[in-house]
């Protein structure tokens, strides 16, 4: 139940991180006009990833898409890279994600099978949110830096004469949609990969059979690959002693997780 | 046809208050800011305020904060303004004028003349 | 606030010649964003409130003749009448439509000569 319900709820999650990011995306005010200690403006300015808009305060509103590729900015580059990466990952996710669904049944797949895509689609999820994250988090760091130029110069004119005032930008709405969806595809990514540690079929555990030699006796544990390489509890450098009498599921024994439902 | 008709002319005393209006037909009331101007006889125009009647939020010009109050009736679709403690320099043609596209002022009231005069 | 100088003061034409108003503001009036020149440009007749001619310093409002034209960039900007005709005897004022507050230019009286 509690895998179920796990899953169930990274995937949700997931989903709506994802339609963030997409939203996000989308939107319009990645940055927005400061408008430093006046509230109202006459001329409001904002941009997105795609495109820019002035809103008088007439209540007229004209956009621009930016139709060029080539003069644009390439951190901007960067940033629809990363969200776009971030938007193609999350809905191969989610696509995924909905035939891992223990509550979803599609013909005779196996856990195993079920775990492997839960597994995929978390990770995907984890990277979708990274990737949002990431973009939005430098386009942030554009705008810092941009401010803070903008400021440093923001009056220019000949013998102050003539003054032009410089248009500077803050942070827009669609920041910090994009983080927080960034953030909930991230948690949802991660919520998937501790379910499929519950969906994994679980492995027989044998206990340790002892064999006698002539001369000594040693007991061979089934533990024994882990302590040699230093993951088991054994990691100081006591030699191992297997003769070979060793099942092939002995090989990968791992102590099983224990899912009540 | 859109039409700003305002209130005919005020003679007042020193020190006494006076409330001009705006009344809007031909379009809608709501979707428009109305904006205020100040003209003395001779002298330049001087943006006074705005109110945007679907909110009532307002802005004013900071020479005219406390002298000038704007205030809307939306059912009567009519905007206000008064001057409080007139003095003489607030003699002068007072218009509304609706802001259109450009930030600029399209349609104006015909003037309402205040004199103040003791 | 932005300060709006217009010239001449007043300016005397002969029917069907050219007129040309200037008008200069203490900052820029174009906004990067659209590329737009906020300038709006006024006629007014006595004892009539002022009309629109021109707003974002070019475009002309409807139903204004073709005769009125507005040009200029930046803090620079002109108001051109190609052919004065007798009932384009007014005062005519350029106003920020930038910032708030909105300000006007003193106004420039234009005659026929």
């Known amino acids: 139940m509690a895998v179920t319900a796990c899953q169930g709820l990274g995937f949700v999650v997931s989903l709506i991180g994802i339609a963030g990011i997409i939203a996000a995306t989308c939107m319009d005010q990645w940055s927005t006009q400061d408008l430093y200690n006046n509230p109202v403006t006459a001329v409001f300015n904002y941009q997105g990833l795609w495109r820019s808009c002035v809103r008088e305060s007439s209540g007229f509103t004209e956009c621009r898409g930016y139709f060029t590729l080539l003069g644009l900015p390439a951190m901007l580059q960067a940033v629809r890279a990363l969200m776009i990466v971030g938007i193609v990952l999350g809905a191969i996710g989610l696509l995924v994600s909905i035939f891992a669904l223990k509550c979803i049944r599609i013909g005779s797949m196996e856990d195993s099978a079920k775990a492997n895509m839960t597994l995929t689609s978390g990770i995907m999820f984890i990277v979708s949110g990274l990737c949002a994250i990431a973009g939005v988090s430098v386009f942030a760091n554009m705008l810092v830096t941009n401010f803070w130029m903008s400021t440093a110069n923001m009056y220019t004119g000949m013998g102050g004469m003539v003054q032009t005032v410089q248009t500077r930008y803050t942070f827009g709405a669609a920041l910090f949609v994009g983080w927080v969806a960034g953030g909930l595809t991230l948690i949802g990514g991660v919520m998937m990969c501790i379910a499929c540690r519950g969906l994994a079929p679980e492995e027989t555990n044998y206990k340790a059979v002892s064999y006698h030699a002539s001369g000594h006796s040693v007991a061979y544990k089934p533990g024994g690959f882990k302590a040699s390489t230093g993951f088991g509890s054994n990691t100081k450098n006591k030699k191992i002693y297997d003769g070979g009498a060793r099942t092939e599921d002995e090989v990968q024994s791992y102590p099983s997780k224990h899912d009540y439902v | 046809e859109v039409q700003l008709v305002q209130s005919g002319a005020e003679v007042k005393k020193p020190g006494a208050s006076v409330k001009v209006s705006c009344k809007a037909s031909?379009?809608?009331?709501?979707?428009?800011?109305m904006h205020w101007v100040k003209q003395r006889p001779g002298q330049r125009l001087e943006w006074i305020g705005m109110?945007?009647?679907?909110?009532?939020?307002?802005n004013y010009n900071e020479k005219f904060k406390g002298k000038a109050t704007l205030t809307l009736d939306k059912s009567a679709s009519t905007a206000y303004m008064e001057l409080s403690s007139l003095r003489s320099e607030d003699t002068a043609v007072y218009y509304c004028a609706r802001l259109k596209t450009g930030n600029s002022f399209d349609y104006w009231g015909q003037g309402t003349t205040v004199t103040v005069s003791s | 606030d932005i300060v709006m100088t217009q010239s001449p003061d007043s300016l005397a034409v002969s029917l069907g010649e050219r007129a040309t108003i200037n008008c200069k503001s203490s900052?820029?009036?174009?906004?990067?964003?659209?590329?737009?020149?906020?300038l709006t440009w006024y006629q007014q007749k006595p004892g009539q409130p002022p009309k629109l001619l021109i707003y974002?310093?070019?475009t002309r409002e409807s139903g204004v003749p073709d005769r009125f034209s507005g040009s200029g960039s930046g803090t620079d900007f002109t108001l051109t009448i190609s052919s004065l005709q007798a009932e384009d005897v007014a005062v005519y004022y350029c106003q920020n439509a930038y910032t708030y507050p909105f300000t006007f230019g003193q106004g420039t009286k234009l005659e026929i000569k």
């Open positions: 031909g379009y809608t009331f709501t979707s428009y800011w």
């Open positions: 974002w310093a070019s």
């Open positions: 900052q820029s009036l174009l906004n990067s964003g659209n590329q737009k020149n906020y």
């Open positions: 109110i945007h009647p679907n909110s009532g939020s307002t």
